[in-house]
Every structure is written in structure tokens, then in C-alpha cells.
């Protein structure tokens, strides 16, 4: 799993007039990390784990970055020509990643009224536009605006790419939180399915980092993929993750089945409760 930093900014317009505020959230490694507090006009950490990432450092830099990005996005929305009356939104999602091989990725995506209309691979400058005619029109509109001051745009996006990666590296280097290993708590439950069958569910929770193997085994051999159901690996709000795997088995054969878990080089097996 690569380390990632994801910025999600939204600006609004009403009857063609761009509103003054903006909404902003930042995710670090898929976890809610920062949000922009519009009352206090400051970036605020999302929970204790986010505060722990930066320790006693202030959030001034993050506040400055989000404020600048919000201003840029409002200017972009002001140049979208097809705004009709009522409420409209322009959303920008920016993601940068550092992979295990140290290669990096950086991308940017624009959504109008919730619909993706323009993406850019920031490193290569490649733009992609969905096929729909509305997306094509919006994309042309926004790209023309961004091209109006080509040098500024070029500098802005390359700086954005560098800044995102620089921030991500800063968080990774300064934070013990992001280098920690938290083993999962594993819990196996059973429930009646249909006559003669039971559903067994294995849940792993409160683990970090995100990478985990969770699978059902019969007589020590992993079951095939299509006989198991997996849940997504999701953040649990505390800077850790949770997931689950379930399968259906014959009643009376419980002792043949175990849940196998592997995480950060450690592994364990968990029986079905009788």
C-alpha cells in the first residue's frame, strides 16, 4: 500500500455568484486527517491520531495551503460559463502517493455538481476527460481558464505536486504514528444461515498499517476466493483500520475451519466458537 495524501476541496455558487467560503478535508493514508474550520478559518486535525502526527507543531502551513487552494478553486468556478440559477458546486480532489519503490504519483480531479469532468496526471501533465459532451464542454472551459496564464498555471501545478509530496514526506518522517505497528483484534462470530448451514464471520479491527491478509481456511487450506465474502478495509476513525471476511459452512463442521490473519509479518489463526 502506498502512503497517500488526499485533498478534497469544494466551492459553491448560487445563481451564478461564487460563494465566499469553501469546504476542505484532507485524508492521510485513507484516514480523515484535517478539515478546514470555516468559523475559525483554520485547518483543524481530525481526532487525536491526527494531532499525534504533527506532535506539538502548529497547523499554520496547512491553513495557508488550504486557504490558497480554496481561493484558486473559487476563481476557477467563476470562469465556468454554464452556471445556471440555483446551487452549483466545483470540487477538486488532489492525491499524491509515495510507493514502496519510492516512485511517486500525483493526480488532480475536477467535479462539477458531483460529476467528474477533468483529471490530470500532474507529473506528466496529461489531461483526461470523460466521453460525455457536458464533461467535454466543462473541461474545455476550465482548461482554457487555466491556460490563460500558462506560466502561472504550470508553476502552480508543479508546485502543487511538489508541495503535496513534501507535506506527505514531512508527515511520514516526523510521525511515529505513521511508522507504528498496531496488531489487529480478531473476533470470529457465527450466525444461522439456512437449514444445516451457518455463516461464520471473521472481523479484524484497530490495526495499522492498512495492509492485511484475512482468509478462511478449511483443514489448513485457504478457501477459494469465490466461496468467501470480503469487506473493504476501512478507516475506523481512530487512525486504524477494520475489515471482515465471511463464509458459509455446514453445521457440525466448525472445527475444520479457522480464520487466518497476517499483518506486518505476524500471523495467527482463530477457530470458530462452538
Amino acid at each position: 500500500e502506498p502512503h497517500s495524501l488526499r485533498y478534497n476541496l469544494t466551492v459553491l455558487s448560487w445563481d451564478g455568484s461564487v460563494q465566499s467560503g469553501f469546504l476542505a478535508e484532507v485524508h492521510l493514508d485513507g484516514q480523515p486527517f484535517l478539515r478546514y474550520d470555516r468559523q475559525k478559518c483554520r485547518a483543524k486535525p481530525q481526532g487525536q491520531w491526527a494531532e499525534d502526527v504533527l506532535g506539538n507543531k502548529t497547523w499554520d502551513r496547512e491553513t495557508r495551503d488550504l486557504t490558497g487552494n480554496g481561493k484558486d478553486l473559487r476563481m476557477t468556478l467563476a470562469h465556468i460559463k454554464d452556471q445556471k440559477e440555483g446551487l452549483h458546486s466545483l470540487q477538486e480532489i488532489r492525491v499524491c502517493e509515495i510507493h514502496e519503490d519510492n516512485s511517486t504519483r500525483s493526480s488532480q480531479h475536477f467535479y462539477y455538481d458531483g460529476e467528474l469532468f477533468l483529471s490530470q496526471n500532474v507529473e506528466t501533465e496529461e489531461w483526461t476527460v470523460p466521453q460525455s459532451s457536458r464533461a467535454q464542454t466543462l473541461a474545455m472551459n476550465v482548461r482554457n481558464f487555466l491556460k490563460e496564464d500558462a506560466m502561472k498555471t504550470k508553476t502552480h501545478y508543479h508546485a502543487m505536486h511538489a508541495d503535496c509530496l513534501q507535506e506527505l514526506r514531512r508527515y511520514l518522517e516526523s510521525s511515529v504514528v505513521l511508522r507504528r505497528r498496531v496488531p489487529p483484534m480478531v473476533n470470529v462470530t457465527r450466525s444461522e444461515a439456512s437449514e444445516g448451514n451457518i455463516t461464520v464471520t471473521c472481523r479484524a479491527s484497530s490495526f495499522y498499517p492498512r495492509n492485511i491478509t484475512l482468509t478462511w481456511r478449511q483443514d489448513g487450506v485457504s478457501l477459494s476466493h469465490d466461496t468467501q465474502q470480503w469487506g473493504d478495509v476501512l478507516p475506523d476513525g481512530n487512525g486504524t483500520y477494520q475489515t471482515w471476511v465471511a463464509t458459509r459452512i455446514c453445521q457440525g463442521e466448525e472445527q475444520r475451519f479457522t480464520c487466518y490473519m497476517e499483518h506486518s509479518g505476524n500471523h495467527s489463526t482463530h477457530p470458530v466458537p462452538s
Epitope: 510507493h99 496526471n121 507529473e123 506528466t124 501533465e125 496529461e126 489531461w127 483526461t128 500558462a150 498555471t153
Partner: antibody, heavy 115, light 108 residues
């Protein structure tokens, strides 16, 4: 109809600088896309050398270190490749190509490095 | 850099048969930045499939592409005599852009 055409000397001496130009017709190089140089040594595979983008940004293959320079002349709708300190290993067919998924290519020009 | 490894290096098949060419990457690639090319002797490569699964202009429907992450596949459903050539995969996710070493599709 988009067309790309490479031009330049077919023979370069070792330690000298290889210079090639790609003339583009049917599309403005400042409108969009990356404008790439790609080479293919005899009997071998393809190697991406670098590009100049529509905005003027240049990106290079680190394997060519600091030997490669790509520039553009927007008034002539051309972009150029310079490869310094060439050796026999730089003997190849040199292609210019448009895009990121390279949708238009020149026909290629053979450059031999020999004294 | 992302290294692309194509397999097999050479594939010997007869016209009418189905061809499956693979390309494996050392790091995950976004499917919108993955492409396939065909090259015949003495010619420039030509774009065959762009963004993993989209046929380039003028490419017949017997060609198809699929894949995600680190594993991609080019399939030719029923080989025609003109399909025997060298095929290259390419990624445009990160700089440097890289190609696979090529798969030579030859007549059996």
C-alpha cells in the same frame, strides 16, 4: 491530418552531439499533448527519451543522464532533440511521437554513430 | 522507474488461433495510463489499444485489452496473417515512461 516528420544527419561522430528536429503539421504543439522522442537500437526494443509538453515543460529519461535536451520552436511548430557525447550505443532509429499513449509517430530516422 | 515485463518473449501460433499476451509491472499503474503498440519490420510502431481497453482508430475488433494494477493483457481473438508482428506495452503513469521488451508473435 496530424503528421510528424523527423529530420537531421544520419551519421554522427563519437563524442559529438546528435541533433534532430521533428516538424509537426495538422496540430499546434502548444495546444495539447506531450511531444516525445523515442529511439530503437537495431534489433532491440523501444526507449523513451523525453518530451516537451504543450506548456513547455520538459521531462527526460534519467538513464540518459544530462546528455539529452529537448526544446521547441513554436513559430515553426517544431521540437528538437540534442544528445551530447554520443557513442556507438546511441546508434538507433529515432522517432518523434505525439501524446502519452503515442497516437501519432514520425516514420523514424536512422542515426549511425561512427568515425 | 516502473519496469514492464512482457511474456512470452515469442509466441508461435497459426492464423485463426487466439493469442494472449501479458505485461507485468513492478509497481501499480493507473489503467488510464497503459497502452499497447504493434510494430512491423521497417515501420514505426502504431498505437493499438489505449487506456488499457480502448481500440485506437482503425484497429479491428478482434483486438482487446484488459487489466489493472500490475497485470495487463492483450488478446487477439482470431489471428489474421497481418497480425504477426512485435507487440509492446507502455506505461505513462510516471516519468520515465517505459516500454516492455516486446513479444514477437510469429507464424507457427
Amino acid at each position: 491530418q496530424v503528421q510528424l516528420q523527423e529530420s537531421g544527419p544520419g551519421l554522427v561522430k563519437p563524442s559529438e552531439t546528435l541533433s534532430l528536429t521533428c516538424t509537426v503539421s495538422g496540430y499546434s504543439i502548444t495546444s495539447d499533448y506531450a511531444w516525445n522522442w523515442i529511439r530503437q537500437p537495431p534489433g532491440k526494443g523501444l526507449e523513451w527519451m523525453g518530451f516537451v509538453s504543450y506548456s513547455g515543460t520538459t521531462k527526460y529519461n534519467p538513464s540518459l543522464k544530462s546528455r539529452v535536451t529537448i526544446s521547441r520552436d513554436t513559430s515553426k511548430n517544431q521540437f528538437s532533440l540534442k544528445l551530447s557525447s554520443v557513442t556507438a550505443a546511441d546508434t538507433a532509429v529515432y522517432y518523434c511521437a505525439r501524446g502519452y499513449g503515442f497516437d501519432y509517430w514520425g516514420q523514424g530516422t536512422t542515426v549511425t554513430v561512427s568515425s | 522507474e516502473i519496469v514492464l515485463t512482457q511474456s512470452p518473449a515469442t509466441l508461435s501460433l497459426s492464423p485463426g488461433e487466439r493469442a494472449t499476451l501479458s505485461c507485468s509491472a513492478t509497481s501499480s499503474i493507473s489503467s488510464i495510463y497503459f497502452h499497447w503498440y504493434q510494430q512491423k519490420p521497417g515501420q514505426a510502431p502504431r498505437l493499438l489499444i489505449y487506456r488499457t481497453s480502448n481500440l485506437a482508430s482503425g484497429i479491428p475488433a478482434r483486438f482487446s485489452g484488459s487489466g489493472s494494477g500490475t497485470s495487463y493483457t492483450l488478446t487477439i481473438s482470431s489471428l489474421e496473417p497481418e497480425d504477426f508482428a512485435v507487440y509492446y506495452c507502455q506505461q505513462g503513469t510516471t516519468i520515465p515512461f517505459t516500454f516492455g521488451q516486446g513479444t514477437k508473435l510469429e507464424i507457427k
